[in-house]
Structure formats: C-alpha cells, structure tokens
C-alpha cells in the first residue's frame, strides 16, 4: 500500500489495533528518485481503560441544608484500577438551587469546578440548598459532570438533587415552611400569623392552577393548656378542633393566655392537604406541635453586646469567652441565657467540658462563663461564621452570631522553580512558580520579607529596589529580580514570608538562562571527529543583543572525547589543540572540532554525554548552558546530521578502497549532511530528517 | 350563631328558569364553600354542586351541568342557584348548605320549588 | 362517581332497642394523605332540613347525643344509635365527601315498633 506525505500530515493515515500488544509495520519511503532501505515502525497498544460510575446518582437534601456526597450518591471506578485521587469530576454545569463545595474550602467562595472520587469518599465535596423565597413542597436540581482519568474515555454523569420537606431532617424538625412558636405576654393575646405558622408548602404541592381550590387542613390533637385558641373569634375544643391555612393566612387565628404565671404552652395538629370544599387529596401530611412560649409583662430582653472573633490555629482548641459571647440581661441569671446554634461553620465545632466530644447546638451563658464552652477546630483554616439564637427564655430569640478565624498551623513556601534570567534581559519577574505560600490551602494573603539579599542583583517593585512584598505583587508580576552585576550566573534570596499570624523562610534561587540556539540532532559516531559550528552551538542572538563577541568556557565534559581547536593546514590528527575557550567567531570560522569518543569498559554501544559551558558577553550576566548528545558505533550507511571531520580509522580499514577514506580536516561528499535536516513537518519530515542523506 | 337564611317558594311553568337566593351570617361568607342539595317529594337528598364565595369558582354536579349556575355577592353575603329549562320532576325542595373541612355543618331552611304547567 | 347504597331502606326498632344501618359504597372512602374516611350521617326529620351527627365516619358532632356511633372503614359503614329514642325517629342518610359528586345514600326510614 502506498501513502503520501501529505495523507499523513493530514492525520488520514489510522492505525488499527488487533491482536498482540506489541507490534507494528514495515515501510520503505521513497521520493519518487530514492528509495530509503527498510524501517519498520514499532506500535505499542495499551489496554483500553474504560470508565464506569455506578452509586445512586441522586441525592436527597433537606430544605437549606447541607449534605455530603457520598459513595452511595456517586461512585467511578476503571477498568484498571484507578486511584480515586486520579479520578476526578469536572462540574459542566452547576447546581441550579443551591451550590457545590469543598468542605476544607471557605463556603463563601466560588462554586466548585473540580473534585476528585476520594473526596466523595472523604465526605468532602458539600451541596448546599438555598432557600427561595416561595414555598415548594419538592423541588428537583441537576448536576452535570464529567468524569475523567486519562487515558480513559471521559464519561458524563447527571447527579440528580432531590430537595424534599418529605425526608426527615434532623436539623429541620418541621415538615411545614415555617412553624417557629409564638411569643405572648402574660395574660394577653397574640395572633398567629404565617410568618410563625405556614403550611403553604403543602399547598405547593398542588400544580398552580388549581392551588387557589386546595387549603391545609390542620386538626388540633392536643389543646393548649394554658390559654385557648380562637378562630374568627370562635374558640376550638375537642368538638371542633380544626382551622385551615386560608384562615391563618387571612389572620384569623388566635391565641389568648389565660393569666397565672409564664410556663410554656402550645399544642400539636396533624396537617394535611385539603382538595376543593374539603374533598380527600392525595398529598402531603404532617403531625408537629406549635410552640407558645408566655413571657413575663416586665421583663426586660437581653442585649447583645459586641463581639471579638475567635482567633486559633487549625487542629487546636480555645475556650469561647466572653469577648466572643456575652449579654446584658439584668433580670436573668447566666444559666437562663440559652444559646442554640442555628447555622454551624465547616471549620470545626462547639464543645462543652464534660458533655461528650461531639458538637453542641444549645448551651448557655453560664457556660461559656465558667469556660467550659470551646470550640474544636478540626476543619479548614477558613474563616467560618457562627449563626445562633440568644435567648433568655422570657423574650424572643435574638440572632447573634460568633465569627471564628482558624489559622493555620504551619505555612510552607512552596518553589516549584528556581527563577529564570533572560542573559540577554539580565531581569525576570518573580510568579506562583518561585514563591507560593500554602497552608491546607492556598495562601493568597501571603506577605514577604527580604532577610537575606541577593549578592549580584536587586529586588524590584514598580522599578524601585524593595525588600517586603506580598503574593498579590508577586501573581500581578509586579517583582522583579533584576542582576546589578554581570559576574554570575546564579545568585539566590532568602525570604521570610508571613500568612495570617504564621512565618516561614525559604531561599529562592536565581540562574541565568543563555541566549544560545543547541542543537545536538541525532547520535553522533563514536570515534569521529565532528565540526562545532552555529548548526550545533549559536550565540549569535547575544552577539547581536550585546553587540560584542560571545565567549564560551568549557566547564564540565565531555566524559568521552574532547574540544579541539581544527588546524587550518592539512596536518595530522596529532595537530589538533584541546580548547578550554572560544568564542562565537570560532563556531562561525568552523574552527572548532569535537572528538566523539567511545564509553571505556563496557561493550560497543548507544551511550549518551553532554558538554557544559560558561556564556559570557559584554554587558550581561554569564550563563551556564549545556549540550547533550547521544553516541553511538560508527555506522558508514548512516547519515549524520553534522558536519564530520574524520571518521573512526577501522572503519577507513574496513573500507578498504583509498578513495572511500577521507582527509582530516576536509569533509568528504559523503561524510555529511552540511545542512542538519531540521523536523519541522510532523512526521514525514522526521523520516526525512533521519533516514534519508 | 351561623345562620343560613332562603329565599321564600316559588312556582314555575315547565321551561322556566329559577334563581334561589341563600343569605349567610354569623360568620366569615368568604371563608366556606356554599353546596345546594335538593329533595323531591318522598325521595332522598341529591347534591348539584358548591360555590367557592371567595374565589367564584364552581363544581357541578354532571346531571345539571349546562343547566346550573351559582353565584355569589360578597357584598350582602349572598350566594345564588339558578336552574334553567325547568321540567316538573325539576320540582323539590332547595337547600343551600355550608360545609366545614369534610362535612355540611350548617344548612338553610329549604326552599320549594314547584314545576307545573 | 361514587355510588352509596344504605340498607335496610327502613327499620322498625323497639324504644331503648339498638338500632343498626348500614352504608356500603361503591369505592373506598379511606383517603390515604390523613388516614381518615370520608363518610358522613344526617338525620333527617319532617319539613326539616338535614342535621349532621358523625362525620369522618366515627367522630360525633359537637352535641349529638352519645347514643349514636359510626363504625367502619373503606367501603362499609354503620351507624348505630345503642338505645333508641321517640325523639330518634327521623330518616338518616350516609354520604361521602371523598370526591364529587358528594353523592348521597338513598336514607333509611327509622320508626318505633
């Protein structure tokens, strides 16, 4: 079969796979005037790694509330075996009623774009329900994912959210949009309205043209004990012991307190919906008691008094105090002051000395002034905000909140890179890659001090040296490494870098880059002498930057041969100079010879090497570059990509015909490819470049 | 106390219309569906249909339907059933009930309507 | 439609005797969003308009005598007054409030032996 350069650059020509793992074909390429001899192409095929998700994919939240993914809801697997670290989720679209988060992230940021099957596993990865303004009974959200594992096809996922006043919530203990208990004064009457009461929800179960037929049923099944319940100014009892939503929503439900003293009071009601004229429905139904707390005509409420944040580092506990929590209440005593916690933060949790290490949601002032109130920071180092309801227990709640800052316990400067110096700039801006402080997380708040200066250059912020500087300069480019003195090629810092409250130092260290075009090509014949020129080594770009003569200094190598300076007489090999130094008019004169040698002590071979060498010109820092290249046997049939001044001398013997030897120091036609075929054209130009002379 | 009070009786020739009133106290008119029942002499009890006087809307019973209409006047409290194409066996006692959650709590006193040429 | 059908159609029952009548309808009554069955009893005595005595099929209304019950579930039902009464002597009919048409039975005539 025949295939053109231009069907393979156009991506026309497949591979398909049967059979064996390993394997490939055998081709010939030909110009249409030459022929190469054989090659043969080697294909390794992999095991195709298939993706599968198995686990519900639906996941039932209470109303407002947060809940974990688990492996119940979402759970991928490979055919291979995959790491759940190396399984990860790509959010193509969001939740549309609430949001997705990562619990060990602040909940205020941004939504969640990535996460991986171990944080599934972990409980990690948070849906949070927000709720509307409108009542609904069952509401219904979507996520769309993606999973991928490369080398794996991806697989999309949908995630259904089931939002449910349905579920039994325990941190909702209510089935109705709203049942929040009353407030009256002693001896007096209050109205209960849809704002303490409302079954409304029930009601949105019903589709809404026909919503305005349908009301809520609501049967009182124990009476309060303490005062009565009136409707329309008609009181309930045993024998008519019903009243709808219509007539809470219209205001027509009353409580009146009978007097004699401020104990508690209320009643439970079974509720449920109601179709046209009070015809059976099928729909939702609950049974709940209706809170009426009675409070005493003189008292006075509580007043909250300012609070301080709570500041600790992450994994520790501290005692909540006063300056966090504390009320001016003058007819309660501490232990009247009821707290309840009515929103926790993800980054820890309320304990009480004595009361078991779990959470607590309710506590008192007493507590928190005997200090046996504490908070365990077993979360993020976010900061995290407490929402609770204060109340003495003769007023209404009051909401207060307590804003907890965890801070980290260690911080780490992270330097993926040392910083790289343009030679011919002689300055580069600092980023992410030299100097990022983490914690559990990113720190982008994060601040630097200079504690040690660079020996041969300056620090620069808006072109001014400086020696404090913060993480946003650094992600805006705005430092700078700029070298005063052209004498080196490294240089290093060291800075102190601080995020929220904790330091860390760390050395960033400075290289200069060479301005400097290597080319190594192919292997090199062992045991030949080949010609160094701009092919190989350019620094012509510097010569220009610079306007000066770039020089070169053999630092290091190489281990099998040598730098040698080309006679420009016709002499013997004996006549070549080992060279230490040159310069770019050397590379340019092609005066400059390197002599491959072979590896010493062990079998003929592919082998490989490399050169170092010191970059100087006028003007800029030096730069240290290297040249590595790969050796291998002379081989008389093989096209080299470099200029050869000699050939191995068995293999002059080998030839056996004088005209087939070649004369040190004059290339032969067919010792070389003066040109070094650069692939530039995929890969057809590859097997051009290396298969054809 | 809930009172539900009807317009007085009424002859009527065969293929006559007739619109019985039902005046409510006692209570909140808006709050609770108003039902007409009717009884031919020495038969039981047959319901036509209700009205909701908060929302004006209305169920009829099949039988009547495109024959019945009820109506109501928030303003006096008053709901209305109207019968058209009056045939004798069309002759019974009206009742208008209220009825409370599931049941007819209350009903007014009846009103007779007679069909005959 | 629901169709409600009460037997006997009359009843003779001696004073201070039980007097026992039954409703049967055609589809059950028992709504399954708050377990409760839809069926109520009227008494109707002459030139006078129905009254209620037991809706949801058990509970009495506020001040009817406690002589009279109602029973059962589903599609059959009771009414049962324990002793009977001069003043008990009326036509009692079922019906049911599950869906309408609110259909009633055709009644049972209840008198003295």
């Known amino acids: 079969r025949t295939r053109s350069g231009s069907q393979l650059d156009g991506g026309l020509v497949l591979f398909s796979h049967r059979g064996t793992l390993d394997g490939g074909f055998r081709f010939r390429l030909s110009d249409g005037e030459h022929t190469s001899p054989g090659h043969f192409f080697r294909v390794t095929a992999q095991k195709q790694v298939l993706l599968s998700l198995k686990g519900s994919q639906t996941l039932t939240v209470c109303p407002g509330s947060v809940q974990p993914l688990s492996s119940q809801t979402l759970r991928a697997s490979s055919s291979a075996g995959t790491d759940p670290q190396l399984l990860l989720y790509r959010v193509v679209r969001g939740p549309q009623l609430g949001r997705l988060f990562h619990a060990q992230q602040d909940s205020t940021g941004e939504a969640l774009v990535n996460f991986t099957q171990a944080e599934v596993y972990a409980g990690n990865i948070l849906y949070e329900h927000e709720m509307p303004p409108e009542p609904f009974w069952e509401a219904h959200d979507t996520l769309e994912l993606q999973l991928s594992s490369p080398p794996a096809r991806d697989v999309a996922a949908t995630l259904a959210v089931a939002v449910s006043f349905e579920a039994a919530c325990p941190q909702r203990p209510s089935h109705l949009w709203k049942n929040k208990g009353l407030w009256v004064p002693e001896g007096q009457r209050a109205r209960i309205t849809v704002a303490a009461l409302d079954a409304s929800n029930l009601l949105a179960s019903v589709p809404s043209p026909q919503r305005s037929e349908h009301d809520v049923l609501f049967q009182v099944t124990q009476f309060p004990s303490r005062g009565q319940l009136l409707v329309s100014e008609e009181p309930l009892h045993a024998g008519q012991p019903h009243f709808l939503q219509s007539q809470l929503a219209a205001g027509q439900l009353v409580y009146a307190h009978g007097g004699g003293g401020t104990q508690q009071d209320g009643f439970h009601f079974r509720a449920h919906l109601q179709g046209p004229a009070g015809a059976s429905v099928a729909g939702p139904q609950t049974s709940e008691a209706f809170a009426i707390t009675v409070r005493d005509v003189n008292e006075r409420p509580p007043q909250p008094q300012a609070s301080v944040p709570l500041r600790l580092t992450r994994g520790s506990r501290a005692p909540i105090s006063r300056a966090q929590l504390s009320v001016v209440d003058p007819d309660s005593a501490p232990g009247e002051i009821e707290y309840e916690v009515q929103r926790a933060p993800h980054n820890g949790f309320l304990s009480l000395v004595g009361g078991g290490l779990g959470p607590v949601t309710r506590f008192t002032q007493a507590d928190v002034d005997s200090g046996r109130l504490a908070f365990v920071a077993n979360g993020s180092s976010v900061a995290g905000i407490f929402q609770l309801s204060m109340s003495d227990g003769a007023s209404p709640p009051l909401p207060m909140s307590l804003a907890v800052d965890i801070l980290p316990s260690a911080i780490e400067v992270q330097l993926r890179a040392p910083l790289e110096v343009p030679q011919a700039l002689g300055r580069s801006s600092l980023s992410q890659q030299q100097l990022r402080v983490v914690s559990d997380r990113e720190e982008p708040e994060a601040a630097y001090r200079l504690i040690q200066g660079p020996q041969y250059g300056h620090l620069l912020v808006g072109g001014r040296p400086t020696s404090a500087f913060s993480q946003f300069q650094i992600d805006q480019g705005e430092v700078v490494f700029a070298f005063t003195n052209s004498s080196s090629s490294h240089d290093h810092f060291r800075v102190l870098a601080l995020a929220r409250g904790v330091n860390a130092s760390a050395v960033v260290n400075v290289t200069v880059r060479a301005l400097l075009h290597v080319w190594a090509g192919g292997p090199w014949p062992q045991g030949a002498t080949l010609r160094l020129d701009p092919t190989v080594l350019d620094a012509g770009e510097l010569a220009n930057r610079t306007d000066s003569v770039p020089r070169f200094r053999l630092l290091e190598g190489p281990r099998h041969g040598r730098v040698v300076r080309v006679p420009r007489a016709r002499t013997e090999p004996g006549g070549s100079q080992l060279v230490e130094q040159f310069t770019q008019q050397d590379l340019e004169d092609g005066r400059l010879g390197l002599e491959v040698g072979r590896p010493e002590g062990r079998a003929p071979g592919p082998a490989g090497d490399s050169l170092t060498l010191e970059l100087w010109a006028q003007g800029v820092p030096p730069a240290v570059a290297s040249l590595d290249f790969a050796t291998e046997p002379y081989n008389a049939a093989r096209p080299y990509s470099v200029a050869l001044l000699s050939v191995p001398e068995a293999a002059r013997t080998e030839a056996g015909k004088p005209e087939s030897s070649t004369p040190t120091g004059e290339p032969g036609p067919m010792a070389s490819s003066p040109e070094p075929a650069v692939a530039k054209g995929g890969f057809l130009s590859f097997l051009e470049a290396n298969m054809f002379s | 106390q809930v009172q539900l009070v009807q317009s007085g009786a009424e002859v009527k020739r065969p293929g006559a219309s007739m619109k019985v009133s039902c005046k409510a106290s006692g209570y909140t008119f808006t709050n609770y569906y108003i039902h007409w029942v009717r009884q031919a002499p020495g038969q039981g009890l047959e319901w036509m249909g209700w009205i909701n006087p908060n929302s004006g809307a209305t169920n009829y019973a099949q039988k009547f339907q495109g024959r019945v209409t009820m109506t109501r006047d928030t303003s006096t409290s008053t709901v209305y059933m109207e019968l058209s194409s009056l045939r004798s066996e069309d002759t019974a006692v009206y009742y208008c009930?209220?009825?409370?959650?599931?049941?007819?709590?209350?009903w007014g006193q009846g009103t007779l309507v007679t069909v005959s040429s | 439609d629901i169709v409600m059908t009460q037997s006997p159609d009359s009843l003779a029952v001696s004073l201070g005797e039980r007097a026992t009548i039954n409703c049967k309808s055609s589809q059950s009554v028992l709504s399954s969003s708050n377990n409760k069955n839809y069926l109520n009893w009227y008494q109707q005595k002459p030139g006078q308009p129905p009254k209620l005595l037991i809706y949801w099929a058990s509970t009495r209304e506020s001040g009817v005598p406690d002589r009279f019950s109602g029973s059962g579930s589903g599609t059959d039902f009771t009414l049962t007054i324990s002793s009977l009464q001069a003043e008990d002597v009326a036509v009692y009919y079922c019906?049911?409030?599950?869906?309408?048409?609110?259909?009633f039975g055709q009644g049972t005539k209840l008198e003295i032996k």
């Open positions: 019906q049911q409030h599950f869906n309408t048409p609110f259909a």
């Open positions: 009930a209220k009825s409370w959650v599931s049941w007819f709590a209350s």
